[in-house]
């Protein structure tokens, strides 16, 4: 029997390499049974996650899963960083894994590091 708890399916240690100036949608896959939970996005600042209050969000409903989307229109250099979605369900707070955005400024795109050069950097050690 499948669990009727809310589940947030952001992949552990996931990353997105994106360009400043482009639009981007950051998806939080949400599984729920009956009532759709209240979901929010926050951005990590050290050990605290700062709630993103005034950002455009939307829901996309699919057959077996829904997506709570954070819109970047466009992506800005300071959007670089780690994000987490959270759901309130039956007075419980459920938190996703964090996902990291690596924003390359188009001005310096000629020096843009490859995905794998990014992957080798020491601040990726998830501590």
């Amino acid at each position: 029997k499948e669990s009727c708890d809310v589940q947030l399916y952001i992949k552990r240690q996931s990353e997105h390499s994106i360009l400043a100036g482009d639009p981007f949608e950051l998806e939080c896959p949400v599984k729920y049974c009956a009532n759709r939970p209240h979901v929010t996005w926050c951005k990590l600042n050290g050990t605290t996650c700062v709630k993103l209050e005034d950002r455009q969000t939307s829901w996309k409903e699919e057959k077996n899963i829904s997506f709570f989307i954070l819109h970047f229109e466009p992506v800005l250099p300071n959007d670089n960083g780690s994000y987490r979605c959270s759901a309130n369900f039956q007075s419980n707070l459920i938190e996703s894994h964090s996902t990291t955005l690596y924003v390359t400024d188009v001005k310096s795109a000629s020096e843009r590091p490859s995905k794998d050069e990014m992957a080798s950097r020491p601040w990726l050690l998830y501590r």
Partner: antibody, heavy 119, light 112 residues
Framework: EVQLQQSGAELVKPGASVKLSCTVS????????IHWVKQRPEQGLEWIGR????????KYDPKFRGKATITADASSNTAALQVSSLTSEDTAVYFC????????????WGHGTTLTVSS | EVVMTQTPLTLSVTIGQSASISCKSS???????????LNWFLQRPGQSPKRLMH???KLDSGVPDRFTGSGSGTDFTLKISGVEAEDLGVYYC?????????FGGGTKLETK
């Protein structure tokens, strides 16, 4: 039932490149990570790297960077490992491994592909 | 990278006897999410590895409860209470807290 079906054994000459494939059934690879693991004869296991098939993002062990390239095609639910500039050190069994919902827990293993590098 | 050190290299047991394998990591495997990404795998001859235990002590489905995993931080142990013939093979610990992910060197469980 989850299955990771790997391509058949390969005998390849030194200096050449080879591409090994891993076709997944039972889950959508876009919802997972696919990892590759190397095992040389009578040796232990080494993590080569992984791909997120949802966006193509890759991570590698530094010692395999430039040697191995991991790709994925979500439309065919297939991942691949290309190994280049082959030497006898690349003779090994290569396993693909799937994570359920990107848990990074190595849930499902393929049966392995034997690569022999010999002139 | 995180070095995973397994001991002993070989463990010779009599069927029915208990066995214990140690795995030590060069740094704490406790992740920022509060979980410890330490798994145990068994590789039988000619087969692919099979996961026995994940997150230190969570037994995988179909794995008999004679297997127990314990430990925290940098020191971990896999215990088999009453080894059976099907338990023979090479055991590997693995860490997934840090990139690159790393395996222990393996412990061969064989009969005396």
């Amino acid at each position: 039932e989850v299955q990771l079906q790997q391509s058949g054994a390969e005998l390849v000459k030194p200096g050449a490149s080879v591409k090994l494939s891993c076709t997944v059934s039972g889950f959508n690879i876009k919802d997972s990570y696919i990892h590759w693991v190397k095992q040389r004869p009578e040796q232990g296991l080494e993590w080569i790297g992984r791909i997120d098939p949802a966006n193509g993002n890759t991570k590698y062990d530094p010692k395999f960077r430039g040697k191995a390239t991991i790709t994925a095609d979500a439309s065919s639910n297939t991942a691949a490992l290309q190994v280049s500039s082959l030497t006898s050190e690349d003779t090994a069994v290569y396993f693909c491994v799937g994570d359920h919902y990107g848990s990074s827990l190595f849930d499902y293993w393929g049966h392995g592909t034997t690569l022999t590098v010999s002139s | 990278e995180v070095v995973m050190t397994q001991t002993p290299l070989t463990l010779s047991v009599t069927i029915g006897q208990s066995a214990s394998i140690s795995c030590k990591s060069s740094q704490s495997l406790l992740d920022s999410d509060g979980k410890t990404y330490l798994n145990w795998f068994l590789q039988r001859p000619g087969q692919s590895p099979k996961r026995l235990m994940h997150l230190v002590s969570k037994l995988d489905s179909g794995v008999p409860d004679r297997f127990t995993g314990s430990g925290s931080g940098t020191d971990f142990t896999l215990k088999i209470s009453g080894v059976e013939a099907e338990d023979l093979g090479v055991y590997y610990c693995w860490q997934g807290t840090y990139f690159p992910y790393t395996f222990g060197g393996g412990t061969k469980l064989e009969t005396k």
